[in-house]
């Protein structure tokens, strides 16, 4: 269809904030459960600890986690799982001070990736019981369809 | 031409990952050589240590480098060279811990800039023999034409 | 109207760099005054310490501040004020080394948000007399209308 000025600008977007974060007893990871704070378009679906891609294409993905942890390095890994395989897209790493009063760092990263229909995107902190700050303006995850 | 729904969304994009990193003897810098991991459109061309702009316009540029170095501050400078002059676009700076086991930080930055046809974009670490982690999900460079 | 190939790509963008930074005597904050370095479109207006939204919509916002300060944690808060209320959109936090020679960190964050006509966007450092580096490639603020 011919595009109107209004249609032209409608990139699908999704900005998510945390509901909670949990660690499985048998794995050295902490996962974040997400809820939408801003949504435009129907191509992305928050689903527990992941986001399901319903509309394949090229996306700008961004992730920030706010850490309050004295573990020497902290960070998050953004991965996609689909078509029987898992792939790390990008990660953020931050060295942390050893003193609890100073151990306070946000870690932001982003990139452009091709996502397939049915992919599940997730943010994993490769530490059991990682101490995160789940404030919606400190820890978040987002997608823009390009 | 009238745009179809598909044409509407075709921002040119380029996401690059490292091939290697080298230092010049006569300059206190480390440069990264790039290869495309994702490409859409023909307006950008990876070219050794730089990216050549073939299609002028406004771009979102992003850069991340993963440092494993005890030098007290590390970081990268994203510059463009063209029309006989060089210009720093943005830079990322990270203080590093002095203990090698803790000296592990990614540094991400991004911004929107007008790039000219023929410009060469490069990422320089203003340290000779900087210790980088060249994992494709830790160190990368990207462009989105807006 | 039917869009031409050229019209299709005209996202409004604004990239701002600092003019100066000041602290009010009666408040524990430092504010940055901004000037445009790149502008496309008329929907955003730099206005002293803030940016006025003239064209409502969904925007990618990004902010970086370069800190040279030994205060144990530094960072910036990006907020919008409008319709009688203030809302924090996102923040960046960085632990700083205690030694002045090492206390050198950029803090970058970004996200996608719905902004309303008349909103005033600002970047606040919640520290009086924060030591910032106001280099235009170290401290900046940007908007892309999606």
């Amino acid at each position: 269809a011919v595009l109107t000025q209004k249609q032209k600008k409608q990139h699908s977007v999704l900005h998510l904030v945390p509901i909670n974060a949990t660690s499985k007893d048998d794995s050295d990871v902490t996962e974040v459960m997400w809820q939408p704070a801003l949504r435009r378009g129907r191509g992305l679906q928050a689903q527990g600890y992941g986001v399901r891609i319903q509309d394949a294409g090229v996306y700008l993905l961004y992730s920030q986690v706010l850490f309050q942890d004295v573990t020497f390095t902290m960070g998050q890994v953004v991965s996609r799982e689909g078509q029987g395989r898992q792939e790390t897209l990008f990660r953020c790493i931050r060295s942390m001070p050893s003193h609890p009063d100073r151990a306070y760092n946000s870690c932001y990263s982003a990139g452009v990736f091709h996502l397939h229909q049915g992919d599940i995107l997730s943010v994993i902190i490769p530490r059991a019981r990682a101490k995160l700050n789940l404030s919606p303006h400190g820890t978040f995850l987002g997608f823009v369809k390009l | 031409a009238v745009l179809t729904q598909k044409q509407k969304k075709q921002h040119s994009v380029l996401h690059l990952v490292p091939i290697n990193a080298t230092s010049k003897d006569d300059s206190d810098v480390t440069e990264v050589m790039w290869q495309p991991a994702l490409r859409r459109g023909r307006g950008l061309q990876a070219q050794g240590y730089g990216v050549r702009i073939q299609d002028a316009g406004v771009y979102l540029l992003y850069s991340q480098v993963l440092f494993q170095d005890v030098t007290f501050t590390m970081g990268q400078v994203v510059s463009r060279e063209g029309q006989g002059r060089q210009e720093t676009l943005f830079r990322c700076i990270r203080s590093m811990p002095s203990h090698p086991d803790r000296a592990y930080n990614s540094c991400y930055s991004a911004g929107v800039f007008h790039l000219h046809q023929g410009d060469i974009l490069s990422v320089i670490i203003p340290r000779a023999r900087a210790k980088l982690n060249l994992s494709p999900h830790g160190t990368f460079l990207g462009f989105v034409k807006l | 109207a039917v869009l031409t190939q050229k019209q299709k790509k005209q996202h409004s963008v604004l990239h701002l760099v600092p003019i100066n930074a000041t602290s009010k005597d009666d408040s524990d904050v430092t504010e940055v005054m901004w000037q445009p370095a790149l502008r496309r479109g008329r929907g955003l207006q730099a206005q002293g310490y803030g940016v006025r939204i003239q064209d409502a919509g969904v925007y990618l916002l990004y902010s970086q501040v370069l800190f040279q300060d030994v205060t144990f944690t530094m960072g910036q808060v990006v907020s919008r004020e409008g319709q009688g209320r203030q809302e924090t959109l996102f923040r960046c936090i960085r632990s700083m080394p205690s030694h002045p020679d090492r206390a050198y960190n950029s803090c970058y964050s970004a996200g996608v948000f719905h902004l309303h006509q008349g909103d005033i966007l600002s970047v606040i450092i919640p520290r009086a007399r924060a030591k910032l580096n106001l280099s235009p490639h170290g401290t900046f603020l940007g908007f892309v209308k999606l």
Epitope: - | S23, D25, D26, S27, D28, T71, F72, T73, G75, T88, I93, P126, R127, A128, R129 | V17, P18, Q68, D101, Y104, K131, L132, N133, L134, S135, P136, G138, T139
Partner: antibody, heavy 121, light 107 residues
Framework: QVQLVQSGAEVKKPGASVKVSCKAS????????MHWVRQAPGQGLEWMGY????????KYNEKFKGRVTMTSDKSASTAYMELSSLRSDDTAVYYC??????????????WGQGTTVTVSS | DIVMTQSPSTLSASVGDRVTITCKAS??????VAWYQQKPGKAPKLLIS???NRDSGVPSRFSGSGSGTEFTLTISSLQPDDFATYFC?????????FGQGTKLEIK
């Protein structure tokens, strides 16, 4: 306390080379770069470049590339600046000055006393 | 290269006067500007860094201000020891560059 002590005055003929030394004390030599700045008689200051003793890497002002060589000796906490193919307009006082390890964005906080180099036939 | 233009080139003043020296950069250098004092036959001495930060041991009568392209060094009340030449310098981008200097002399 921080001190930078430079070598003595030199008189050289055109076409010759000169090597100036700068011995540092009172701080960790490898944590700071050493800048070299010159000042012609009655003139202003001109930045020539720096040497980073941490990795023995120089950064030169393009104007001097090909003629200047900056080196350092960590064991002696000493930086060196050698200028070749000397001309009469290289007659100047040459200063070393300490800058922080991430050289950009930091001023030069301590300076040597200067070394006078005279180029004359 | 960034050009740093200092004015005036010479300034005559008396003890107790308030004096201001200005420096204009040919492009935006943020607040990455230093001011140095130099006396005849001596090395420059750092007074101000980051446009406004007094170095340790520098008297409070010296102050710096500005960002972007316009910078000022102010001496609030001249003392006999202040008669010297003053240089500004940008260290935002290579090559680092200096102003041509302002000679402050006794009126």
């Amino acid at each position: 306390q921080v001190q930078l002590v430079q070598s003595g005055a030199e008189v050289k003929k055109p076409g010759a080379s000169v090597k100036v030394s700068c011995k540092a004390s009172g701080y960790t030599f490898t944590s700071y770069v050493m800048h070299w700045v010159r000042q012609a008689p009655g003139q202003g200051l001109e930045w020539m470049g720096y040497i980073n003793p941490y990795n023995d890497a120089p950064k030169y002002n393009e104007k001097f590339k090909g003629r200047v060589t900056m080196t350092s000796d960590k064991s002696a906490s000493t930086a060196y600046m050698e200028l070749s193919s000397l001309r009469s307009d290289d007659t100047a006082v040459y200063y070393c000055a300490r800058g922080l390890g991430y050289a950009l964005y930091y001023a030069m906080d301590y300076w040597g006393q200067g070394t006078t180099v005279t180029v004359s036939s | 290269d960034i050009v740093m233009t200092q004015s005036p080139s010479t300034l005559s003043a008396s003890v107790g006067d308030r004096v201001t020296i200005t420096c204009k950069a040919s492009q935006n250098v943020g607040n990455n500007v230093a001011w140095y004092q130099q006396k005849p036959g001596k090395a420059p001495k750092l007074l101000i860094s980051s446009a406004s930060n007094r170095d340790s041991g520098v008297p409070s009568r010296f102050s710096g201000s500005g960002s972007g392209t316009e910078f000022t060094l102010t001496i609030s009340s001249l003392q006999p020891d202040d008669f010297a030449t003053y240089f500004c310098q940008q260290y935002n981008i290579y090559p680092f560059t200096f102003g041509q200097g302002t000679k402050l002399e006794i009126k």
